[in-house]
Structure formats: C-alpha cells, structure tokens
C-alpha cells in the first residue's frame, strides 16, 4: 500500500510522462542557475515536501535528483548559509522500506550519507554541509531541476 506522498510522487511523474515531448532546453531560464547539465531553481519560500514536488511540476521541472556525491557537493556549494534546508526528490517508500527517488529508482547507499531516521513520512533535505531526513510535513525550501539538452550537430539526410 502506497502512502499519500508516494501516490503524489507517482501521479506527478506519470502525468509528466504523458505530456507531449517538448523541445530540448539549451539555456537556463531567468532566475535558474546552471550546474553542469542542469538548471536549478532554489526556492525563497517554504513548503512541505508534497507541495514542493507539485510546485516543481508546475514549473515543468522536478525536485532535484542527485546522481552522486560529486553532484551533491557542487549543489551544496550554491547554498549560502548553514541554516537553510532544501527538499530534494527523495523520500522514504514505506512499501519498499527504502529511500526512493521520484523517478522511481532507489538510493544507492554510497551516494548520500543521510543523517536521521529512515521511516514513514520521512523526506530528504540538503544543507550546506549535510543530508538530513526530516518529516515530510516540515516547511522548508526546495530545489527544482530542469535537464539541459546537450547540443549535437544535426545531420540532415540527402534530399
């Protein structure tokens, strides 16, 4: 049985998959920061995890997905104060008893050193220095991401 947070996460992901393919993003929109092949938007307001997830969806983006420790460190370097926490796209799946990214993949235990409990209604936040498990109802900031499309030379078939 899925928790309400899991359902919300799955619903948003499925609705994104159903939408028509958009043209690739070559540059970050205004107010978004480029970090390698991603555009990141750091919120200035606060929300519970569910609302943060939904907000990113309305911006045609997703809560931040972190591939590895290197990407984590580079993202943390953009956070200006140690007392600011940001939601990312990772929460505890009660049905699978594991940390699950909103794209459906599970956390590789080597990627993030999470401080706090892995239990129902736990979602993951990052600060300047650490990764924390917090109650998903906690109102903190969040980070949305858009993937940049790598620029490739187009090859046109002979006419």
């Amino acid at each position: 049985q899925k928790s309400s947070i899991e359902k919300c996460s799955v619903d948003i992901q499925q609705s994104r998959n159903k939408t028509t393919e958009r043209p690739g993003l070559l540059n970050c929109p205004i107010y978004w920061q480029q970090l390698r092949e991603k555009c990141l938007l750091f919120s200035h307001t606060v929300n519970p995890w569910n609302n943060s997830l939904a907000d990113c969806s309305t911006k045609e983006s997703s809560l931040l997905l972190i591939r590895d420790k290197d990407e984590l460190i580079h993202t943390q370097n953009l956070i200006r104060d140690k007392a600011i926490l940001f939601w990312i796209g990772l929460n505890f799946s009660l049905s699978e008893k594991n940390w699950k990214w909103i794209n459906g993949s599970f956390l590789n235990s080597n990627d993030l050193e999470i401080r706090g409990d892995a239990k129902e209604n736990s979602c993951i936040s990052i600060s300047q220095t650490s990764v924390y498990s917090e109650y998903c109802s906690t109102e903190i900031r969040w980070i949305c991401q858009k993937e940049l499309t790598p620029v490739r030379n187009k090859v046109y078939p002979d006419s």
């Epitope: 200035h44 606060v46 200006r80 104060d81 140690k82 007392a83 600011i84 926490l85 401080r115 706090g116 409990d117 600060s127 650490s130 924390y132 498990s133 917090e134 109650y135 109802s137 906690t138 109102e139 903190i140």
Partner: antibody, heavy 119, light 107 residues
Framework: EVQLVESGGGLVQPGGSLRLSCAAS????????MSWVRQAPGKGLEWVSA????????YYADSVKGRFTISRDSSKNTLYLQMNSLRAEDTAVYYC????????????WGQGTLVTVSS | DIQMTQSPSSLSASVGDRVTITCRAS??????LNWYQQKPGKAPKLLIY???SLQSGVPSRFSGSGSGTDFTLTISSLQPEDFATYYC?????????FGQGTKVEIK
C-alpha cells in the same frame, strides 16, 4: 492552541551547569525547527541556538558555542538547552521559540525562564 | 554577522498618532525581516514577517515595508495597548540578529 512552557531556570554559580526544558504542545513538534532566544535584564533580544525538526542539525551563536548544547526529544515533545561553564554574562531570561530554519520567523514563544549566574 | 540598527531608540506618542519605526541592516537581507512587539515581563510577539506580511491575529493598523537594507514598521493609529518595545530581526543568515529595540511610550 500552540503552547511552549520553559522550565529549569534558577541561580547557579559561575562555571556551573543548568539544563533548561521547553514543553511543546498544540502542534506537530517534529515538523518544526526550534530555537532558544535570551534577554539579559533591561537589554534586547539575542538568538542563542536552533535545532532542526529531526534534531540532526544544530546552530549556535558564537557567544555560547562549545558551552551550550541544544537537543530535542520528539517522543516527549520537549526541547532542551544544556548550559555548561556558565558565566555572569549568561544571566538572562531564556525563551524557547518555534522556528529556526532560514527564513523562519519565531511565530510562537514561551513565557521565559530566568537564569541567574552569580556567586 | 549582520548588524540591525533601529531608530529611534525611544519615542513618545499619543493615542491616535501615526508611528513609524525604522530598521537598517548592515548588508542587504532581501525581505527577510520580521518585527516583534514586547511588553514588560512578557515574551515577544510576532507582528510582521517577511518585511510586509501581517501575522495572523495582528491588527491591520500594523504594517511593514522595505527590502534590501531599509525597513519600516508603521502603526497607523496608536492604541493604548500598543505602548511597548518593538524589535526587528533578520532571518537572512546565521547568526539571527535583532535590532536593539524601540520603546514606544505615552506622551
């Protein structure tokens, strides 16, 4: 109704220790960062320390770093401030307040508990 | 650390007066400024958060404005229960810092 009730204040000698408690009710305690703020007699407000909802993350003012420790017990809905190596300048009314993540304001405060450091 | 400077330190006013208190930050804090009211022997009470948002239950005669480094708390028509000390606070960065306070007294 949100309520914060501090206790544990009193008279202590310089170099001594004291533990303050703040009992919280009327809200989901573990979903909120919490802070301690103090006010010396006749003076203004000074932020002392904050702790995240999970308790995993703590922050301190330089004036108390290494001497004070903030903690919380979500099973008891209680916030604590362990104060060691107390100095005369720590004499103040200590308030617990809800909030502590940036950019939180302190939307609820306890009534305060007086700590007097004197020989 | 960000220093917060309030002016005036104290003022005398009459019931019905329009009162303005200013708060200046030593560096830009965007709109991360809050205002509190404190009466003798009582805990502070949040009036305004995020520079201009009125906290629930606070009378509409209180208003806040400003961004960057300069902020203002205005009481449009001073009431007897408004005589108190007012503090500004920044929540832009740690350590969280308060202004030194402005005492509003009866003229």
């Amino acid at each position: 109704e949100v309520q914060l009730v501090e206790s544990g204040g009193g008279l202590v000698q310089p170099g001594g220790s004291l533990r303050l408690s703040c009992a919280a009710s009327g809200f989901t305690f573990s979903s909120y960062a919490m802070s301690w703020v103090r006010q010396a007699p006749g003076k203004g407000l000074e932020w002392v320390s904050a702790i995240s909802g999970s308790g995993g993350s703590t922050y301190y003012a330089d004036s108390v770093k290494g001497r004070f420790t903030i903690s919380r017990d979500s099973s008891k809905n209680t916030l604590y401030l362990q104060m060691n190596s107390l100095r005369a300048e720590d004499t103040a009314v200590y308030y617990c307040a809800r909030g502590g993540y940036l950019p939180d304001a302190f939307d609820y405060w306890g009534q305060g508990t007086l700590v007097t450091v004197s020989s | 650390d960000i220093q917060m400077t309030q002016s005036p330190s104290s003022l005398s006013a009459s019931v019905g007066d329009r009162v303005t208190i200013t708060c200046r930050a030593s560096q830009s804090i965007s709109s991360y400024l809050n205002w509190y009211q404190q009466k003798p022997g009582k805990a502070p009470k949040l009036l305004i958060y995020a520079a201009s948002s009125l906290q629930s239950g606070v009378p509409s005669r209180f208003s806040g404005s400003g961004s960057g480094t300069d902020f203002t708390l205005t009481i449009s028509s001073l009431q007897p229960e408004d005589f108190a000390t007012y503090y500004c606070q920044q929540t832009y960065s740690t350590p969280l810092t308060f202004g030194q306070g402005t005492k509003v007294e009866i003229k």
